[in-house]
Amino acid sequence: MVSRGALADEPPSLDPVQSFSQEAVDTGRVLYLHSRPEAWSDAFSLDVASGLGAPLEGVLVELEVLPAAIPLEAQNFSVPEGGSLTLAPPLLRVSGPYFPTLLGLSLQVLEPPQHGALQKEDGPQARTLSAFSWRMVEEQLIRYVHDGSETLTDSFVLMANASEMDRQSHPVAFTVTVLPVNDQPPILTTNTGLQMWEGATAPIPAEALRSTDGDSGSEDLVYTIEQPSNGRVVLRGAPGTEVRSFTQAQLDGGLVLFSHRGTLDGGFRFRLSDGEHTSPGHFFRVTAQKQVLLSLKGSQTLTVCPGSVQPLSSQTLRASSSAGTDPQLLLYRVVRGPQLGRLFHAQQDSTGEALVNFTQAEVYAGNILYEHEMPPEPFWEAHDTLELQLSSPPARDVAATLAVAVSFEAACPQRPSHLWKNKGLWVPEGQRARITVAALDASNLLASVPSPQRSEHDVLFQVTQFPSRGQL
């Protein structure tokens, strides 16, 4: 009870009371002080006496405490994908007897749902409500409608508002659990077929066979096949066990293999399912190619006269394939060029860069030439090698080595002499000239003798036919 101070300037004080008068009530000095949070109702009993007649005993005074914030309570809920649920008690509750009775009690949507809408049962369904009355909630006219998207959760935030007494609730968040529904069919997005070697086993790549589904994982997308017309489908790790189903996840992991046998062109019919929806009538084509084998014939040895040019020929280098490939498509690449000369093309500038590629057709035409470059030191026989790589996709490459023998022993139309030098001699009429090593040099005959032992040897020229217009 409020009691005035003894002195005029002393502030009033609050004292607990055991009794009070009607006058104290009339002057507003009897107060109820709420002291227990979360306890919204209270009561006390009185004995009322006026001095006239018998007193009234046990008069019960009930108190309803109005909380500072409207006690709005929320319960999380679940809804099927694309489904709806009425927002009514106990999902949404304002506790206590007072606030729900207020005519002006309304609910504001502070944060609307992201994947759905709050709608009035009979109202326009275009967009979500921004506010609605408590009476609508009690009449079960407000519902949450999910938009059918592939989302697992949604949420929205409401706040209660009592306009006539300027009270609000704290913002209350609702969490919606969306129960997924398999409502989307699988879609075959890629079906390019498979190309492989005859008799081989190869993975069916995900790039060749792929499907998608908005609401199913790759492990739930199942391909079910009928008998393949040119082989069998097996899983990696179990090549002896033929399977009639596999998943997109297995394709993605490279686990699905096709083992070819029989005709070159074939495949298998299949249906695609996500467990709920089936897409039938598809065909996966498997085309096998015969293995193309390259072979190399010919001596693979080129004999060249010293310092001369010699064309490569079919006797030397002759490539062919099991598929009868056009010689223009049989390509040689020079992996390691000659050390004692150079390789060039007859139709191209002979001073140009070293030849890197040529075809079997160019060999047949005699257009690929080897030119031997004379070294400063005499020799009798020298050996050179060319390392080549023969290719003709899709066949496997074949490595080849072309041996080059440069020898004075061979009969050379371009060089009649077997000697290192035999240039002949220019002699003025009636005079003499010295035959020097620059004109006649047979030291190449000793080239096979090791240098230290060469002094022990000499070359002897025996004249078998003397000059008829002069003398030595």
């Epitope: 199942v222 079910t224 009928e226 008998q227 393949p228 017309s229 040119n230 082989g231 069998r232 066990t241 033929e242 399977v243 009639r244 189903s245 596999f246 998943t247 046998r261 029989g262 005709t263 074939g266 019919r269 399912s273 467990g275």
Partner: antibody, heavy 113, light 107 residues
Framework: QIQLVQSGPELKKPGETVKISCKAS????????MHWVKKTPGKGLKWLGW????????TYADDFKGRFAISLETSARTVYLQINNLRNEDTATYFC??????WGQGTTLTVSA | DIKLSQSPSILSVTPGETVSLSCRAS??????LHWYQQKSHRSPRLLIK???DSISGIPSRFTGSGSGTDYTLNINSVKPEDEGIYYC?????????FGGGTKLEIK
């Protein structure tokens, strides 16, 4: 309509060989696999093996590897089941079926001395 | 090899009852499961293919369900002519295998 017609009943002695046929009609023969099943009185169905009608490649269940041979004659649209070195326990009814849908009427084989 | 276990092995029911026959695989078979009915001295008859696909000409009281390893054949309001042995067959991987069968008796 689709039909699988099997050859008639067989009475054989132990050690002999039998060849049962299954002739298909009403569909593209090489589109669907052909299977053989053994049904013994008082026992269930046992899958014996199948043949890929496009490639001619047979596959057998472990219990039927060795004496059993599945073959086909594409031009005659016929699949065969040959059992060599017959035993008493081979006495049964043998069914052919195409993929999983269509079944032959069954061929009863009795092996008895 | 994939093993198929059928249960129960024998089932005795009165006409009009609804029955459920179970078939369990030893590993996932991706719905490659087919149900057959066999009567004495007759060829098996396909009732359901791929776990749940119905077959034309088969009464609608026969329905199938299941995925992965567990499959069920339901017969709604059983009729006397439904008596026989019911087999499941897995066609997922070789060797294909049958279940041991469920004998359905009508009282």
């Amino acid at each position: 309509q689709i039909q699988l017609v099997q050859s008639g009943p067989e009475l054989k002695k132990p050690g002999e060989t039998v060849k049962i046929s299954c002739k298909a009609s009403g569909y593209t023969f090489t589109d669907y696999s052909m299977h053989w099943v053994k049904k013994t009185p008082g026992k269930g169905l046992k899958w014996l093996g199948w043949i890929n009608t496009a490639t001619g490649e047979p596959t057998y269940a472990d219990d039927f590897k060795g004496r059993f041979a599945i073959s086909l004659e594409t031009s005659a649209r016929t699949v065969y089941l040959q059992i060599n070195n017959l035993r008493n326990e081979d006495t049964a009814t043998y069914f052919c079926f195409s993929y999983y849908d269509y079944w032959g009427q069954g061929t009863t084989l009795t092996v008895s001395a | 090899d994939i093993k198929l276990s059928q249960s129960p092995s024998i089932l005795s029911v009165t006409p009009g009852e609804t029955v459920s026959l179970s078939c369990r695989a030893s590993q996932t078979i991706y719905k490659n499961l087919h149900w057959y009915q066999q009567k004495s001295h007759r060829s098996p008859r396909l009732l359901i293919k791929y776990g749940s696909d119905s077959i034309s000409g088969i009464p609608s009281r026969f329905t199938g369900s299941g995925s992965g390893t567990d499959y069920t054949l339901n017969i709604n309001s059983v009729k006397p002519e439904d008596e026989g042995i019911y087999y499941c067959l897995q066609g997922y991987s070789t060797p294909w295998t049958f279940g041991g069968g469920t004998k359905l008796e009508i009282k």
